[in-house]
């Protein structure tokens, strides 16, 4: 039973040209995470695989970076980076988590962070 | 350039351990991910694992039960143990490496392979 | 696991034209499909990663496409040397699976 839950950064704004922070943490299980893949919509960013490290999607390498943690730093952003997010937390033994995360990047200089909030699991087996 | 080579016996019994060792130049394998895959005759291609550049290992689940992969730092090479092998297991057994940071999980280096039967 | 289906799986193709083989994910795999090409007696060889990227020193005649559960891999003007056994690969999450492999031939 997959008992896991996926605590997420939420909704959150930047400034166009600025940088953010994308953070997943898991918690509620002893399940070991094997691999946390990082997407928007089909496009895979980033994959941080426990045994291997980092492999940023080459895409995409020029404007993010690894970390902090598990996290991912998307820098120098335009308003097409507006969009959903997602952090893939590939498990053992439990399966597959999935947390969302809202991006809104914005042309002026109001861009607060929105409140960190908890996204139910979904049940994703391999 | 990196350069990777397969040796151990051409032929094992059934219910016996596979061994097999890949001597790498060119490159250390205290960086990256060197891998064990296996192509059995006129078929498609296996992975069975990896051991990577910290010694870490992570096997198929498939093979898990059977399959052990270690390395010796002192002489750049890493070894393959497949136990309890049955007819199924013939195949040609590549080692290869995998520069997980650059293209993820896709192979840029393979040894030549070599061919394990099994047979009593 | 995920299974990598290839279509088809022989490809008979005139000098000069155009290849197209095909990679079914049984699952979303995103980008993170590589293609490898395999000549009679060698081993495998890596032509393209992260679905469209070729890598170091592969022909620009050859081409990756395709995101999610769908790819392609295409050589747009066959040349002799070309003749090979190609396969697919996903490493979106392990253990990384291959394709069953297309046969490429002159017609």
């Known amino acids: 039973m997959m008992t896991g839950t996926i605590e997420t950064t939420g909704n959150i704004s930047a400034e166009k040209g600025g940088s953010i922070i994308l953070q997943c943490h898991l918690s509620s299980t002893t399940a070991q995470v094997t691999q946390v893949n990082w997407e928007q919509q089909d496009q895979l960013l980033a994959i941080c695989n426990a045994d291997l490290g980092w492999h940023i999607s080459p895409s995409f390498k020029d404007r993010v970076a690894p970390g902090p943690g598990l996290g991912l730093t998307l820098q120098s952003l335009t308003v097409n980076d507006t969009g959903e997010y997602f952090c893939i937390y590939h498990t053992y033994p439990d399966g597959t988590y999935t947390g969302r995360i809202f991006l809104e990047v914005l042309e002026s200089s109001v861009a607060e962070h929105g409140a960190r909030f908890q996204i139910p699991h979904h049940h994703h087996h391999h | 350039e990196v350069q990777l080579q397969e040796s151990g016996p051409g032929l094992v019994k059934p219910s016996e351990t596979l061994s097999l060792t890949c001597a790498v130049s060119?490159?250390?394998?205290?960086?990256?991910?060197w891998n064990w895959i296996r192509q059995p005759p006129g078929k498609g291609l296996e992975w069975i694992g990896y051991?990577?550049?910290?010694?870490?290992?992570y096997y198929n689940p498939s093979l898990k039960s059977r399959v052990t992969i270690s390395r010796d730092t002192s002489k750049n090479q890493f070894s393959l143990k497949l136990s309890s092998v049955t007819a199924a297991d013939t195949a040609v057994y590549y080692c290869a490496r995998l520069d997980f940071s650059n293209y993820g999980g896709a192979v840029d280096y393979w040894g030549q392979g070599t061919t394990v039967t099994v047979s009593s | 696991d995920i299974v990598m289906t290839q279509s088809p799986d022989s490809l008979a193709v005139s000098l000069g034209e155009r290849a197209t083989i095909n990679c079914k994910a049984s699952q979303n795999v995103r980008t993170a499909v590589a293609w490898y090409q395999q000549k009679p007696g060698q081993s495998p060889k890596l032509m393209i990663y992260?679905?469209?990227y070729r890598y170091t020193g592969v022909p620009d005649r050859f081409s990756g496409s395709g995101s999610g559960t769908d790819f392609t891999l295409t050589i747009s003007s066959l040349q002799a040397e070309d003749v090979a056994v190609y396969y697919c690969?996903?490493?979106?999450?392990?253990?990384?699976?291959f394709g069953g492999g297309t046969k490429v031939e002159i017609k």
């Open positions: 992260s679905a469209s």
């Open positions: 060119g490159y250390s394998i205290t960086s990256d991910s």
């Open positions: 690969q996903q490493y979106y999450t392990t253990p990384w699976t």
């Open positions: 051991i990577s550049y910290s010694g870490n290992t």
